[in-house]
């Protein structure tokens, strides 16, 4: 039960995280610049990964996609790439994890297959979260190190004189959304990996022998009720009178101890 809960919770946490990564990638407020002290413009300027916007004191707002001819920082392209890779990996991870969920039965999928899929999706979520955290951190570092050198002209209200001052950039809301979302995706991935360990069937140290009584299709094996159900025996309609005992390795698929959780 604990395995199912861990897996389900990991899936939900990752889902929320990936939704957050998508939201952060689409948001316009990655960096903000307050120009209200500029008597010429009196505007609030903010930039995203795909476009930059300006909001005037009157309420008028306009956004425009980046013009490549104005030159975009190389780091911006790197951040875009990291966020997109994070989203793609996260989306694939979600798809895989849906089929890996223990509470969902798809055909006769074995627990070992579900465990492998859970581990795969967990790793994908971890990498996705790391990509998002890396992307947001690279952008934040770019703000801290580069933006104070911006050549934008600002005007001070002191007597109407024109003065070029350092442009003040601050972290936009998207950065915090991205950090939290990346963290959630990472946590969800770790939870999926933990759940995978519980899902994986433990290998026995002995070879169980299944005994067949002539004329019956029930395999008698050590292990009580679960072993005596005949689950997995004679799956390919083999003759059951082919020589008595067979090792468990020869039988196609036996139930694991987790089948009745």
């Amino acid at each position: 039960m604990a395995v199912t809960a861990c897996q389900g919770l990991g899936f939900v946490v990752s889902l929320i995280g990936i939704a957050g990564i998508i939201a952060a990638t689409c948001m316009d407020q990655w960096s903000t610049q307050d120009l209200y002290n500029n008597p010429v413009t009196a505007v609030f300027n903010y930039q995203g990964l795909w476009r930059s916007c300006v909001r005037e004191s009157s309420g008028f707002t306009e956004c425009r996609g980046y013009f490549t001819l104005l030159g975009l920082p190389a780091m911006l392209q790197a951040v875009r790439a990291l966020m997109i890779v994070g989203i793609v990996l996260g989306a694939i991870g979600l798809l895989v994890s849906i089929f890996a969920l223990k509470c969902i039965r798809i055909g006769s999928m074995e627990d070992s297959a579900k465990a492998n899929m859970t581990l795969t999706s967990g790793i994908m979520f971890i990498v996705s979260g790391l990509c998002a955290i890396a992307g947001v951190s690279v952008f934040a570092n770019m703000l801290v190190t580069n933006f104070w050198m911006s050549t934008a002209n600002m005007y001070t209200g002191m007597g109407g004189m024109v003065q070029t001052v350092q442009t003040r950039y601050t972290f936009g809301a998207a950065l915090f959304v991205g950090w939290v979302a990346g963290g959630l995706t990472l946590i969800g991935g770790v939870m999926m990996c933990i759940a995978c360990r519980g899902l994986a069937p433990e290998e026995t140290n002995y070879k169980a022998v299944s005994y067949h009584a002539s004329g019956h299709s029930v395999a008698y094996k050590p292990g009580g009720f679960k072993a005596s159900t005949g689950f997995g025996s004679n799956t390919k309609n083999k003759k059951i009178y082919d020589g008595g005992a067979r090792t468990e390795d020869e039988v196609q698929s036996y139930p694991s101890k987790h089948d009745y959780v």
Partner: nanobody
């Protein structure tokens, strides 16, 4: 990316009027435009500004006498100067600022047009 060409300057008597024009050319229209002047032997002084949304602002020294306007279809900024005084004598520069469509805000300047107020 943005070229600014001012025109309309000249010699005018005190109390007279002049209309300055600033034609902006380029593939990107500006988000804010302004007129800035520099009197002989002095520093730059901001005169008036206008945003794409239509918000206007004026320096106290020109309020009530100067009017800034913008024709977005022609991509041109105007400065109507009335009741001119001798202290308005200066080289008037056009300034355009771009915030949208660029990651770093950009500022562009024209070459200036001389306005002389003298009797």
């Amino acid at each position: 990316q943005v070229q600014l060409v001012e025109s309309g300057g000249g010699l005018v008597q005190p109390g007279g009027s002049l209309r300055l024009s600033c034609a902006a050319s380029g593939e990107i229209s500006s988000d804010a435009m302004a007129w800035v002047r520099q009197a002989p032997g002095k520093g730059l002084e901001w005169v008036a500004g206008m945003t794409r949304g239509g918000s206007t602002n004026y320096a106290d020294s020109v309020k009530g006498r100067f009017t800034i306007s913008r024709d977005n279809s022609k991509n041109t900024l105007y400065l109507q100067m009335n009741s001119l005084r001798a202290e308005d004598t200066a080289v008037y520069y056009c300034n355009a600022e771009i915030y949208t469509g660029t990651f770093y805000p950009r500022s562009y300047w024209g070459q200036g047009t001389l306005v002389t107020v003298s009797s």
